[in-house]
Amino acid sequence: IWELKKDVYVVELDWYPDAPGEMVVLTCDTPEEDGITWTLDQSSEVLGSGKTLTIQVKEFGDAGQYTCHKGGEVLSHSLLLLHKKEDGIWSTDILKDQKEPKNKTFLRCEAKNYSGRFTCWWLTTISTDLTFSVKSSRGSSDPQGVTCGAATLSAERVRGDNKEYEYSVECQEDSACPAAEESLPIEVMVDAVHKLKYENYTSSFFIRDIIKPDPPKNLQLKPLKNSRQVEVSWEYPDTWSTPHSYFSLTFCVQVQGKSKREKKDRVFTDKTSATVICRKNASISVRAQDRYYSSSWSEWASVPCS
Amino acid sequence: RNLPVATPDPGMFPCLHHSQNLLRAVSNMLQKARQTLEFYPCTSEEIDHEDITKDKTSTVEACLPLELTKNESCLNSRETSFITNGSCLASRKTSFMMALCLSSIYEDLKMYQVEFKTMNAKLLMDPKRQIFLDQNMLAVIDELMQALNFNSETVPQKSSLEEPDFYKTKIKLCILLHAFRIRAVTIDRVMSYLNAS
C-alpha cells in the first residue's frame, strides 16, 4: 500500500481467483483513543472499533472511503483504491490502446517545435467518475523539471455504438534550449482513477522524436503563362522554431483529386515554392517535416486548383 | 560562445554539401546497424545515450545562432558559453566566433573518426563478420574535415591488447552511431545557418 495523495491510498493486488489479498491497517488521524468506530462509504454498518482498523482487501467491495467517527462526529477519512496486477502485468482497463506507432501505446505526445513544449493525449470510453493527474520530468534518476497543466477533455467521438473521449495535457520543460542535443528522455506519468480503480501509464521520448510541425501557412497559387503548370508558394508555420535557416523544414507538395486513389502530381522541395500541374476539381496540398531529423510530417495545408 | 550572423564565407557552401552527405551517410549506417543487429539493443529506446565529445568540445554552444543567445537555457548549459553584449558584434569577433564553432565541429569529427576506426578494426576480427563500418561514412567524415581545413594534432588510434568482446563492441557501435547522428544533425543545421547568413 502507498499514499497517492493526502488520505488516498493505493492497494496493489495480485488479481486471480481466490487470491489472498492484502492486509491493510488503517489508523484514525486523531488524538482520541477511545470510542472510535469505523464505517465504509455511505453505509452505517460499523466495521470495527478502536484507533486502528485491520482489513483484508481482496476485491473492489473492500475498497472505498473508510471513515472513523466518535459520537457522531467524523474524525478522518482514508480512501482506498485498488491497482490490479494480472499475470504479473498491471491492468490497463481505463485507457484505450491507440496501437500507434506500436501496440500498448496508451499515451501519445507531439511537439510543434523544439521549445520544450509538448502535448500528450489519451483515449477512454469511460465518461464519468474519472480523474487524471499528470507528472513529467527530463530523465528519471536526476530528474529535471517539466511543468504540466491539468488534463482536460479535448474531444468526444462516436465510434460505432461507443462514445470515445479524448483527454489532453500540455507540458513545458522548465529550461529548454531549442538547439540542445537531448541525451535524457522526457518521462510522462499519468495517474488514472476510475471509481475505485487506480492505474498508471507512462511514456518516454525525446522531443526530437515527437516533432510534428504545424502545416505551412499562406498557400498561394500563380498560374504560369502558356502552361498547365502552377507555381505554388507558402510560408513556414508561425509555431516553428526560429531561426528558420537553422531549424529548416522540407516540404511535400501534392496535387490530388478528392479520392486517394486518383492520380496525382507530387514533388518534394526544401524551398517555399514549387511548380506543379493543376487539374480541374483537384487540390494542391503542402506539408512540412524537419529537414534534418525525420520525425512526423505536418498535416496538409490545401487550396483548390481552380 | 555563439554564432553571430556572419559575412558569407566563399568556402562555406562546400561545407554545407559535405555536412548533408555526412548526415545521409550516418543515417544510412545507423539504419543498416539497426537491421543487421536486430537482436541487439540498438534502437533509440534501448540504448544509453552517450556523447563522447562531452566536456571535450562544445559544438552546440559554440555554434549557437545569434537569435538563440537571448535564451538563457542555451547559454547556461556550459561555463564556456559566450554571452554577447548587444545584438551586433564587430566582424573580427564574428569571424573569431565562427572559427571557434568550426574548429569545435572539426574536433568532433576527429574524435568520432578515431572511435569509428578503432571499432572497425575490432569488428574486422569478428568471426561472424556481421557488420562493418561503411567506408563511405568514414570517407565523408574525412571530406568534411578537409573542407573545414583545420590543422590539429593527430589523435593516435586506440589499440587494445585484450581480446575484443564483440557483443559489447556492437552495442558500443549503436551508441556511437546514435550520438553521431544527433551531432550530424547539429552540424547540418549550423552549416545551413552559416550558408544563409
Epitope: R261, E262, K263, D265, R266, V267, T269, D270, I277, R279 | -
Partner: antibody, heavy 118, light 107 residues
C-alpha cells in the same frame, strides 16, 4: 494485371511522320497519366511528354515541342504519339509508360522501333 | 534542363557481392529521384521511388539513398538476375530527365 501493348515496328523516310499506338488493359485508362519516352540505339532514355486521358491535357519536352502530338482515345483505352518532320536521329525505340503519379513510371510498354532512313 | 550524371558507366561485380551506383544532379532536386533496371530488349522496371522508397514486388536487396544532388542505388548482394543497366530519373522539374545508365556486369 496492368499491361501496355504497343504497335509494331515502323520504317519511315526523313521528313515524314510516324504515329505509334499504346493500348492499355487492366485498370481504368483515365486513372493514369500516360507518357512517351524514347531510347536511341545505345543511348539513354529521353522523355517526350505526357497526356492526361481524362481531359486531354498534355505537356511536352521543349526539345519536341511543335513536332510531337500525344492523344488518347478513352473508348479504346489507347494513347497515340505522333512525331513529324522525322530525321535520321529520331531512329529509336519509342516506349509508352504510365503511372498514377505524374512524374515517374511504374508500367511500361514493350517499345516500338521506329527507323528513319532514306 | 537538369542534367543527370551516373557513375560508373560500367561496373564489374562478382555475384554475391554488393554494388553501389551513383547518380548526381546538376542542381538540387531534393528527393525527386527514381531508379529503374533495364535489361537488353526490355522496358525499364521501377525499383525505387523518391530516392529511398521501396516498390512492392522489388527485392529488399535494392535500396536507395541521397537527397539534394547526390544519390546512390545499393544492391546488397548481387544475384544473377541483377546484371543489367540501372538508370536514374529526376522528377524535380519538367522536362523529366534520365541518367545515361550504369551497366552492371559479371566480373
Amino acid at each position: 494485371q496492368v499491361q501496355l501493348v504497343q504497335s509494331g515496328a515502323e520504317v519511315k523516310k526523313p521528313g515524314s511522320s510516324v504515329k505509334v499506338s499504346c493500348k492499355a488493359s487492366g485498370g481504368t485508362f483515365s486513372d493514369y497519366y500516360l507518357h512517351w519516352v524514347r531510347q536511341a540505339p545505345g543511348q539513354g532514355l529521353e522523355w517526350m511528354g505526357w497526356i492526361d486521358p481524362e481531359n486531354g491535357d498534355t505537356e511536352y519536352a521543349p526539345k519536341f515541342q511543335g513536332r510531337v502530338t500525344i492523344t488518347a482515345d478513352e473508348s479504346t483505352s489507347t494513347a497515340y504519339m505522333e512525331l513529324s518532320s522525322l530525321r535520321s536521329e529520331d531512329t529509336a525505340v519509342y516506349m509508352c509508360a504510365r503511372n498514377k503519379e505524374l512524374r515517374y513510371f511504374d508500367v511500361w510498354g514493350q517499345g516500338t522501333l521506329v527507323t528513319v532512313s532514306s | 534542363d537538369i542534367v543527370m550524371t551516373q557513375s560508373p558507366l560500367s561496373l564489374p561485380v562478382t555475384p554475391g557481392e554488393p554494388a553501389s551506383i551513383s547518380c548526381r544532379a546538376s542542381q538540387s532536386i531534393s528527393i525527386n529521384l527514381h531508379w529503374y533496371q533495364q535489361k537488353p530488349g526490355q522496358a525499364p522496371r521501377l525499383l525505387i521511388a523518391f530516392a529511398s522508397q521501396s516498390i512492392s514486388g522489388v527485392p529488399s536487396r535494392f535500396s536507395g539513398s541521397g537527397s539534394g544532388t547526390d544519390f546512390t542505388l545499393t544492391i546488397s548482394s548481387l544475384q544473377p538476375e541483377d546484371f543489367a543497366t540501372y538508370l536514374c530519373q529526376q522528377s524535380n522539374s519538367f522536362p523529366l530527365t534520365f541518367g545515361q545508365g550504369t551497366k552492371v556486369e559479371i566480373k
